[in-house]
Amino acid sequence: CDLPQTHSLGSRRTLMLLAQMRRISLFSCLKDRHDFGFPQEEFGNQFQKAETIPVLHEMIQQIFNLFSTKDSSAAWDETLLDKFYTELYQQLNDLEACVIQGVGVTETPLMKEDSILAVRKYFQRITLYLKEKKYSPCAWEVVRAEIMRSFSLSTNLQESLRSKE
């Protein structure tokens, strides 16, 4: 399955939107910095494309879930947030189309269980952090920066997969 060129453009647009969503300086939130333990090894280049697609899908789905909450709606600009949802939704569709085409359907669910679990637990930590910080502006800024970093890392994986072909 070839992810359309528009998919990587969408990834770049998603990162741009995340950058534009910034409301306060991260430097004013240094005391709120947190290591969320992004499971980078689960996005390593050793996987075949068929194996990475469900993990990338999970990553984007979890980002969508995180920013779809009412607490998130209160924290960010509504117009930017709507554009952000649209980009994520399109990327989910692209990845789902690949799965439907039968890429790795037989082995994927079991093979990638651990990677998908690692991603879900990463977002559990982010969700709990926000709750502990009472969804403060600084907490959301820390999370926005973290999602930019982790999304960028997973996007780099997509690009490396494209270039390998």
Partner: antibody, heavy 123, light 108 residues
């Protein structure tokens, strides 16, 4: 309530290997990881590693990488821990314990434990 | 790796006393901490998970608190059955974990 039943005590020579089994009384492998923990005489609890019985994936603290092997036979509902190159410092009671793979309540505690297997390493 | 440091290493208290055991993590682990009671010749028993949630059938005299790096296990009124060694365990990057060194509780 599910039970984890471990194999019996072992006496081994230094340099040898030991394999301990941990059988679940009912299927718990789809929803739980199996962990191994040991307690040496007069010491505290030490975590040895985790196993996802359905995928075979494992994880270990640095100290035990390469010397502890964790495997399972899902058809037998049994997990195994093998420790190689045994020394007297490996004399301990070894426990298996389960933990949820994913918990909405953040419950990542070891809620069910085996009864323990005593391993003595002596020349 | 994340380390957890427990204190005190041992304590002696009378029946009815309030007992407090502390655990400090080497980094912010939110509330990913569990507490166990371990008696000689038995398997450890999970008392509290997620820093403050009492496991099923654990007496209400046990309670846990804390968040970030500092955590506390409290026994409000020590009972004869409460002797043993208590351990904290961090599960921030579950399924990886680590245990504290333990606190031995003796009855005076």
């Amino acid at each position: 309530q599910v039970q984890l039943i471990q194999s019996g005590p072992e006496v081994k020579r230094p340099g040898a290997s030991v394999k301990v089994s941990c059988k679940a009384s009912e299927n718990t492998f789809d929803t739980h990881y199996i962990n191994w923990v040991r307690q040496a005489p007069g010491q505290g609890l030490t975590w040895l590693g985790w196993l996802n019985p359905t995928t075979g994936k494992t994880g270990f603290p640095q100290k035990f990488k390469g010397r502890v092997i964790l495997t399972s036979d899902t058809s037998l509902n049994t997990a195994y821990m093998e420790v190689s190159r045994l020394t007297s410092e490996d004399t301990a009671v070894y426990f298996c314990a389960r933990v949820l793979k994913l918990s909405d309540e953040y419950n990542y505690g070891f809620d069910v434990w085996g009864q323990g297997t005593t391993v003595i390493v002596s020349s | 790796d994340i380390q957890v440091t427990q204190s005190p290493s041992s304590l002696s208290a009378s029946i009815g006393d309030r007992v407090t055991i502390t655990c400090r993590a080497s980094q912010n682990i939110l509330t990913f901490i569990n507490w166990y009671q371990h008696k000689p010749g038995k398997a450890p028993k999970l008392l509290i998970y997620a820093a403050s949630v009492l496991q099923n059938e654990v007496p209400s005299r046990f309670s846990g608190s804390g968040s970030g790096t500092d955590f506390t296990l409290t026994i409000t009124s020590l009972q004869p059955d409460d002797f043993g060694t208590y351990y904290c365990q961090q599960t921030y990057l579950t399924p990886q974990c680590s245990f504290g060194q333990g606190t031995k509780v003796e009855i005076k």
